[in-house]
């Protein structure tokens, strides 16, 4: 992620650009893109960015819509970096268990769990 | 996931079993397992379950510790099912954009974004 803009600001700006260009983006009435059925978004980042790629290839580029897709590719780069950080550090069992406990706690309280 | 126990109950039970068996699990002083640096847990499910596999292979089985690993494998099955649901449904651009907007909104408010 370039140092000029922190990721949090990038996300905010991208949300605004998404609203601005909604009409242009939905112009293709025949295009179908995979949409996750559930709301555990982080599990679906690969599919979301594949969908963005499909949309980009079908959208007339130019002006700030280009900025939108540029931002989205920077967000993807950030997420890919985060994914790399999932497995880089090998720690003792003690620390792994503390993280596992936290992960299950997050699942327990924050995930949208279907019965 | 077997119908006998809903996933949410499974997660709760697993948290309890994890506390119970902590001492047995940390017995291996030399074992190193990848621990994510950040707290965006959902991005790291693959690594977390690889770590669980490593831990299981190094842990003397029997009694309720077996139940712990059985539960963890059921949780993995649930998550794998959720991941499959990321790309099964092909929808119109409108619905994809709504999901993308929601995803970015969640990133904006709930993700742990390092500068």
């Amino acid at each position: 992620i370039p140092t000029e803009i922190p990721t949090s600001a990038l996300v905010k700006e991208t949300l605004a650009l998404l609203s601005t260009h909604r009409t242009l983006l939905i112009a293709n009435e025949t295009l179908r893109i995979p949409v996750p059925v559930h709301k555990n978004h982080q599990l679906c980042t690969e599919e979301i960015f594949q969908g963005i790629g499909t949309l980009e290839s079908q959208t007339v580029q130019g002006g700030t819509v280009e900025r939108l897709f540029k931002n989205l590719s920077l967000i993807k780069k950030y997420i890919d970096g985060q994914k790399k950080k999932c497995g880089e550090e090998r720690r003792r069992v003690n620390q792994f268990l503390a993280y596992l406990q936290e992960f299950l706690g997050v699942m327990n309280t924050e995930w949208i769990i279907e019965s | 996931i077997p119908t006998e126990i809903p996933t949410s109950a499974l997660v709760k039970e697993t948290l309890a079993l994890l506390s119970t068996h902590r001492t047995l699990l940390i017995a291996n002083e030399t074992l190193r397992i990848p621990v994510p640096v950040h707290k965006n847990h959902q991005l790291c499910t693959e690594e977390i379950f690889q770590g669980i596999g490593t831990l299981e292979s190094q842990t003397v089985q029997g009694g309720t510790v077996e139940r712990l690993f059985k539960n963890l494998s059921l949780i993995k099955k649930y998550i794998d099912g959720q991941k499959k649901k990321c790309g099964e449904e092909r929808r119109r651009v409108n619905q994809f954009l709504a999901y993308l907007q929601e995803f970015l909104g969640v990133m904006n408010t709930e993700w742990i974004i390092e500068s």
């Epitope: 503390a98 706690g105 | 950040h38």
Partner: antibody, heavy 119, light 107 residues
Framework: QVQLVQSGAEVKKPGASVKVSCKAS????????INWVRQAPGQGLEWIGY????????RYNQKFKGRATLTVDKSTSTAYMELSSLRSEDTAVYYC????????????WGQGTLVTVSS | DIQMTQSPSSLSASVGDRVTITCKAS??????LSWIQQKPGKAPKTLIH???RLIDGVPSRFSGSGSGQDFTLTISSLQPEDFATYYC?????????FGQGTKVEIK
């Protein structure tokens, strides 16, 4: 910017308890562990323990187990370290420090709180 | 507990000197070691983490090396503001433990 601001100096009698606070600002409190470290006058640094504000899970240096209690108040983004049954050798500056990641290096330190134990 | 042995416990040096401080762990700590600077009456400040990774804003004259049990902090050209006490910290296993410190004084 990211800051940890600790409570002021305390003077306590032997046998009493002290509770030091550490108020976090400039980041999401639940995303980083808070560690506690102490330094006796003219001495080195000693780790007391850490707390994960997300789930209140804490871990102590065996030396302080049973006497130190780490807690958090998520509503005010404040971490607390309470030390009971104080003795003169507990006279020290107590620091809180934020963990950069999970069991990672300390990237931000509080300014320290001097606790004096004297009869 | 993992013992961290730092040497020397103190040293005298002049501005511009190259200074080396070592830290030895009683067991393998991988590279989970940080170097911390503390000036009199001030809070500690972390300079290096993961044995050799310089923290943003820390001058490049500071560098770290080592892995396993033996680690080194080097100040390539000592500046007036570098006179302080330096500690190593292992964060590989609980309890985290510090070296006893190395006081860098003006010659």
């Amino acid at each position: 910017q990211v800051q940890l601001v600790q409570s002021g100096a305390e003077v306590k009698k032997p046998g009493a308890s002290v509770k030091v606070s550490c108020k976090a600002s400039g980041y999401t409190f639940t995303n980083h562990h808070i560690n506690w470290v102490r330094q006796a006058p003219g001495q080195g640094l000693e780790w007391i323990g850490y707390i994960n504000p997300y789930n209140d899970y804490s871990r102590y240096n065996q030396k302080f187990k049973g006497r130190a209690t780490l807690t958090v108040d998520k509503s005010t983004s404040t971490a607390y370290m309470e030390l009971s049954s104080l003795r003169s050798e507990d006279t020290a500056v107590y620091y809180c420090a934020r963990d950069y990641g999970n069991f990672w290096y300390f990237d931000v330190w509080g300014q320290g709180t001097l606790v004096t134990v004297s009869s | 507990d993992i013992q961290m042995t730092q040497s020397p416990s103190s040293l005298s040096a002049s501005v511009g000197d190259r200074v080396t401080i070592t830290c030895k762990a009683s067991q393998d700590i991988n590279s989970y070691l940080s170097w911390i600077q503390q000036k009199p009456g001030k809070a500690p400040k972390t300079l290096i983490h993961r044995a050799d990774r310089l923290i943003d804003g820390v001058p490049s004259r500071f560098s770290g090396s080592g892995s396993g049990q033996d680690f080194t902090l080097t100040i390539s050209s000592l500046q007036p503001e570098d006179f302080a006490t330096y500690y190593c910290l292992q964060y590989d296993d609980f309890p985290y433990t510090f070296g006893q410190g190395t006081k860098v004084e003006i010659k």
